[in-house]
């Protein structure tokens, strides 16, 4: 059976296009298996992976993915052009930067080509699904005898990110956490020169440009204190 996916154009009578395919309507056997859920993540607004659990299918099935943007100039239905595979079965789709429009509602449609009635449509707000790269180039500056300042860089618009700094000494069993806003710097006012400190940072696309829940990976850790170089006591950028 051929299926036709129609393009939404936003008016009342054709918003059905979110749901439409041409398919037989006279079947008395109405029940079918649900499709796996599509999960999308936008990596540093450089590319997006939309993936599903292909192993949830009772038999290996090359599900197909189409997408468009709701009520926008980009509402033309697109076929996935770069499938991701798991054991030779489609398990995702990768979209490139030019195909990502953060502030338009992304509509993604998964379908079983062998059973056209198995077609589900999801709508995602991509600005809430951005995961930035981990912070880079961590550096420590000694501001005074007992005060340290940690700085880092992100490969993204800095004002869009919030950060979480963790630090601990070799004597600590757990990390101390501190939230940091878009300024990407952190000061530790009281440092014990007899202890060795470890710092790490992660970042999140929240709250100014989106409402993402997922953090980046942790940065490489940086260390300060006993055992660190004595050559320049005012600048330390030693990575583990």
């Amino acid at each position: 059976l051929n299926t036709t996916i129609l393009t939404p154009n936003g008016n009342e009578d054709t918003t059905a296009d979110f749901f439409l395919t041409t398919m037989p309507t006279d079947s008395l056997s109405v029940s079918t298996l649900p499709l796996p859920e599509v999960q999308c993540f936008v990596f540093n607004v450089e590319y997006m992976n939309c993936t599903w659990n292909s192993s949830s299918e009772p038999q290996p099935t090359n599900l197909t993915l189409h997408y468009w943007y709701k009520n926008s100039d980009n509402d033309k239905v697109q076929k996935c052009s770069h499938y991701l595979f798991s054991e030779e079965i489609t398990s995702g789709c990768q979209l490139q930067k030019k195909e990502i429009h953060l502030y338009q509602t992304f509509v993604v449609q998964l379908q079983d080509p062998r059973e056209p009635r198995r077609q589900a449509t999801q709508m995602l707000k991509l600005q809430n699904l951005v995961i930035p790269w981990a912070p880079e180039n961590l550096t420590l500056h000694k501001l005074s005898e007992s005060q340290l300042e940690l700085n880092w860089n992100n490969r993204f618009l800095n004002h869009c990110l919030e950060h979480l700094v963790q630090y601990r000494t070799d004597w600590d069993h757990s990390w101390t956490e501190q939230s940091v806003d878009y300024r990407h710097k952190f000061s530790l006012p009281s440092v014990d020169g007899q202890k060795r400190y470890t710092f790490r940072v992660r970042s999140r696309f929240n709250p100014l440009c989106g409402s993402a829940q997922h953090w980046s990976e942790w940065s490489h850790p940086i260390h300060w204190g006993s055992n660190t170089s004595k050559e320049n006591p005012f600048l330390f950028a030693l990575e583990a």
Epitope: R118, Q119, T121, M123
Partner: nanobody
Framework: QVQLQESGGGLVQPGGSLRLSCAAS????????MNWVRQAPGKGLEWVSG????????TYTDSVKGRFTISRDNAKNTLYLQMNSLKPEDTAVYYC????????GSQGTQVTVSS
């Protein structure tokens, strides 16, 4: 796994009203376009109405336009169908579904319109 539980059906006289509910679990309900479909005795499945994920776009089959209203509460993971001015030809088992022309194995809720 995906679970959909319909409720609110019953026996009603022509011209009467019912409100169907569908409680969803096992998937991210708030991202899905959802549908009501129905199956009359001895007939095939008929799509009734659909709603987009945030509830701001709805659509209906011609025979129920102006009488039925689909809505959703994403905070409660619940889909609704308000049915007014019911007619005998609305008699069917009603299902909510993430599919437009199939169900996912839910039991449905029986609506019978009869005097």
């Amino acid at each position: 796994q995906v679970q959909l539980q319909e409720s609110g059906g019953g026996l009603v006289q022509p011209g009467g009203s019912l409100r169907l509910s569908c409680a969803a679990s096992g998937f991210t309900f708030s991202t899905y376009v959802m549908n009501w479909v129905r199956q009359a005795p001895g007939k095939g499945l008929e799509w009734v109405s659909g709603i987009d994920s945030d509830g701001d776009s709805t659509t209906y089959t011609d025979s129920v336009k102006g009488r039925f209203t689909i809505s959703r509460d994403n905070a409660k993971n619940t889909l609704y169908l308000q049915m007014n001015s019911l007619k005998p030809e609305d008699t069917a088992v009603y299902y909510c579904s993430m599919f437009r022309m199939a169900t996912t194995g839910s039991q449905g809720t029986q609506v019978t319109v009869s005097s």
